[in-house]
Every structure is written in C-alpha cells, then in structure tokens.
Amino acid sequence: HNTTVFQGVAGQSLQVSCPYDSMKHWGRRKAWCRQLGEKGPCQRVVSTHNLWLLSFLRRWNGSTAITDDTLGGTLTITLRNLQPHDAGLYQCQSLHGSEADTLRKVLVEVLADPLDHRDAGDLWFPGESESFEDAHVEHSISRSLLEGEIPFPPTS
C-alpha cells in the first residue's frame, strides 16, 4: 500500500477519505486505527456502526468521527480540533471476522494556523521539509507517495 498524506490545520477539522470497492467490501464494517510505527500494530480508534446497514450514521470516539457511504464506496473520517499529537500514521480498514484488510494508509500532518501567531514556531508551514522525499502533491490537503516509496523509517 502507498501512503497518502493528509494535511490539516491546527485547531480546525480534517477530513480523510478512503475510497474502496463497494462490491468487494459489501456487508463489511470499517475501522480507523492509529499505527504505532510503520511496522507496528494498528490500534483501533473508531469503527462504524455495529449494524452494517446503519454505517452511514456518524460514530464518534473523542474528537474522531467515522461514517461510511457503503453504496458509493467511500469511508470518511473526521478529526475535529486537530492537534500536533494527532499527527501520525493511520489506516482505514475493512473488517471481516477477526481479520482486517487495509483500504488505505494515511499519514496525517498538522500545519500551523496561519492566523495564530502565538505558537507559530511549533507547527509545520508548507514549504519546509516534508516527511516524505519527492512526494507527489495531489491536492492541497493530500498527496500520495510514488510507487515503491516508503515513509521514512524509524524514530520511535
């Protein structure tokens, strides 16, 4: 899986979308998890409604919401009041039994609020060094790694 980078502004909301094949994943609940390092386990943050037919209902865990358009094949995650500690590697998952298929790997980056000068030195501004080398910018809020490219491994 390539990793898609989504950039959000501190204090604002960030929407992450994960497209999938609606037929292949028919009847499956979805989940959003935070990965503890590139090779680490993925800790569940929030999952869609227990009843698949009600997956369109938004479910919250703290400041993170999930909703699933099962016909259109798009899982949407909302991170409200984005903070620096929300930065990291995540996965959109399709659940079946005790197994989980990865729909998309996502790197969340937190940008500085251009109107907030108090902590301007604490957050990343576009134009400075990025987490990925030669990353292809698709949109202002997301980009994908080139084929075969991996996120910089390690620090803890």
């Epitope: 590139e38 990291g88 060094s129 987490s131 803890s156």
Partner: antibody
Framework: QVQLVQSGAEVKKPGASVKVSCKAS????????IHWVRQAPGQGLEWMGW????????KYAPKFQGRVTITADTSTSTAYMELSSLRSEDTAVYYC?????????????WGQGTLVTVSS | DIQMTQSPSSLSASVGDRVTITCHAS??????LSWYQQKPGKAPKLLIY???NLHTGVPSRFSGSGSGTDFTLTISSLQPEDFATYYC?????????FGQGTKVEIK
Amino acid sequence: QVQLVQSGAEVKKPGASVKVSCKASGFSIEDFYIHWVRQAPGQGLEWMGWIDPENGDSKYAPKFQGRVTITADTSTSTAYMELSSLRSEDTAVYYCHADHGNYGSTMDYWGQGTLVTVSS
Amino acid sequence: DIQMTQSPSSLSASVGDRVTITCHASQHINVWLSWYQQKPGKAPKLLIYKASNLHTGVPSRFSGSGSGTDFTLTISSLQPEDFATYYCQQGQTYPRTFGQGTKVEIK
C-alpha cells in the same frame, strides 16, 4: 526473552574493514527496522543507517555513504554492518538498534555494543 | 541534515530536584522526537517517544513536551538512578540525528 546480541570487540588497522553482527532472539527481524548507531569514546550518539530486513531496503547517513554496508540474513535473524577504509576516527562502540519505524514506534531494542578500535 | 541542539550540555543537581533539558531542532519535526537515557558503558534506553509519550516501564517522573522545533524533557524529582546522559533524537527525516547530549551529574 527479547534481545539483540552483537559480536565481540575488534582491533583493526587503518584502511582495513570491519563487519559487526547483531543477532536477534525472541522476535523476528523482518518485523523491525534495524539501525546502526555509533559512539566514539567520550562523544555522543551518531546514526549511521538502517535496513528493512523484510525487503533488504537500506538507507545510510551521507557521512558514511559509500563506506558502510548494512545487510540482513532473515534465516538466521542476524543483521550486519560493514565499515570499510577504516581510520582512527572510526574507533567507537557500534550499536545495533531495532524499532518499528517512524511515526510512533513503541518498540525499542538495543544490542550491548561492539567496540571497534582502529590503530596502527 | 536536521541539527539538534540540546541545552544545557551538563548540569549538576541534587536528589529531589526538578530538572529540565531542552532540545531545539533546526527545522520543523512536528512531534517526531525521542528522548534517550544512557549510562556509562551501557546502550541507550528509550524514555519518551513522539515528544510526550512515556515508553513502557519508564517512571512517571519523566515527561516530555513540545512540538515543531522546541522540546523539553522534565524529571520532576531526580532520583539517584537518574544520573546519566540524556539525548534527544529526531525522526522526521533521514538521517536521524541526535542532540549532543546533556550530562546530569550529582551536585
């Protein structure tokens, strides 16, 4: 018990090469990135490079590029660091270090260190 | 390369003291900073990852804070076993780089 065990101390002459091994036990090295970090006597820590044993991908610090080679043998769960064209400034303790990569790894294991002395 | 600058380079403190070590990155590194403790003749030990997360088994008197370019390691009440050298390390980009270290000595 999870641990990384490194090979013993080495004494080398300037211009020679040294190959240090790092054997993992209690876990599979394919599930980790293996880094090499060195520390000259009385000095700080210096990151040299890493390998992903799962696919053999490696990356080196520019300072060591062309002089260091990091490899891994998954069948023996062992990683290796070879440093060539040794000079006296390469005298240091060399550590191997395993983690799950960037972005919040909670796993962190270190070898006991291998002292490499370069002296004529 | 991203330069990591620690201060102070050394400090003397007594058991029970509150100790603060700072680490400054030459570029933005978000929260991708770790703190290590090293004792003479031993390998480093991870204390804090992702700027503020306490590693398993690390006493709660250790805490980390910061994001972007400025980070802090705090020991709320120094214990005899805490006398050691502390290093910060950035994990935003390669090569990973360490601070020069802060040696915490007994006053």
